[in-house]
């Protein structure tokens, strides 16, 4: 869907340089506006902290597949 | 500018097949899961099936499993949805769209960027 006229962008600047424990991370949210200089990843942490990551990265990538299938419904 | 486009709608017998496929541009595609949704007149926009950045995850509606299969080639950009003995009740608009938000697979809200969609239509 377009995104709201002037909305407010959250753009991610610098990636974190370690890998974060899964059992940290509560969601992930993507940046993939325009107006941001990269593509990101912004994980949520259990505290609320939010943390920009580098989603090329493997780690990250198993990451978000983690907190997706801990949300999937299981269908028998 | 993410784009996704859709192509390999059209007008099937039951029982018979169609491959959809879905073309991303404006993004790095290799890291995206993507998903399929349908949607037929006057209902709701429904999820169809998923698949994961890698592709080594798919998730399916009950009502396509073991029919449609979901699959991806990162290195062209592009997802598919291959479609075997299609019902009526399979008549819809098929789109995908990029999922952004962690959470469900099939949860709509989860996803942005959809394509206009291609038609599928399935006879008696």
């Known amino acids: 869907q377009p995104d709201a006229i002037n909305a407010p962008v959250t753009c991610c600047y610098n990636f974190t340089n370690r890998k974060i424990s899964v059992q940290r991370l509560a969601s992930y949210r993507r940046i993939t506006s325009s107006k941001c200089p990269k593509e990101a990843v912004i994980f949520k942490t259990i505290v609320a902290k939010e943390i920009c990551a580098d989603p090329k990265q493997k780690w990250v990538q198993d990451s978000m597949d983690h907190l997706d299938k801990q949300t999937q419904t299981p269908k028998t | 500018e993410v784009q996704l486009v859709e192509s390999g709608g059209g007008l099937v017998q039951a029982g018979g097949s169609l491959r959809l496929s879905c073309a991303a541009s404006?993004?790095?595609?290799?890291?995206?899961?993507m998903g399929w949704f349908r949607q037929a007149p006057g209902k709701e926009r429904e999820f169809v099936a998923a698949?994961?950045?890698?592709?080594?995850?798919?998730y399916y509606a009950d009502s396509v499993k073991g029919r449609f299969t979901i699959s991806r080639d990162n290195a062209v950009n592009t997802i598919y949805l291959q479609m075997n003995s299609l019902k009526p009740e399979d008549t819809a608009v098929y789109s995908c769209?990029?999922?952004?938000?962690?959470?469900?697979?099939?949860?709509?809200?989860?996803?942005?960027?959809w394509g206009q969609g291609t038609q599928v239509t399935v006879s008696s």
């Open positions: 698949i994961n950045s890698g592709g080594s995850y798919t």
């Open positions: 769209a990029v999922k952004i938000y962690s959470g469900s697979y099939s949860s709509p809200p989860g996803y942005n960027h």
């Open positions: 404006g993004l790095t595609f290799s890291t995206y899961p």
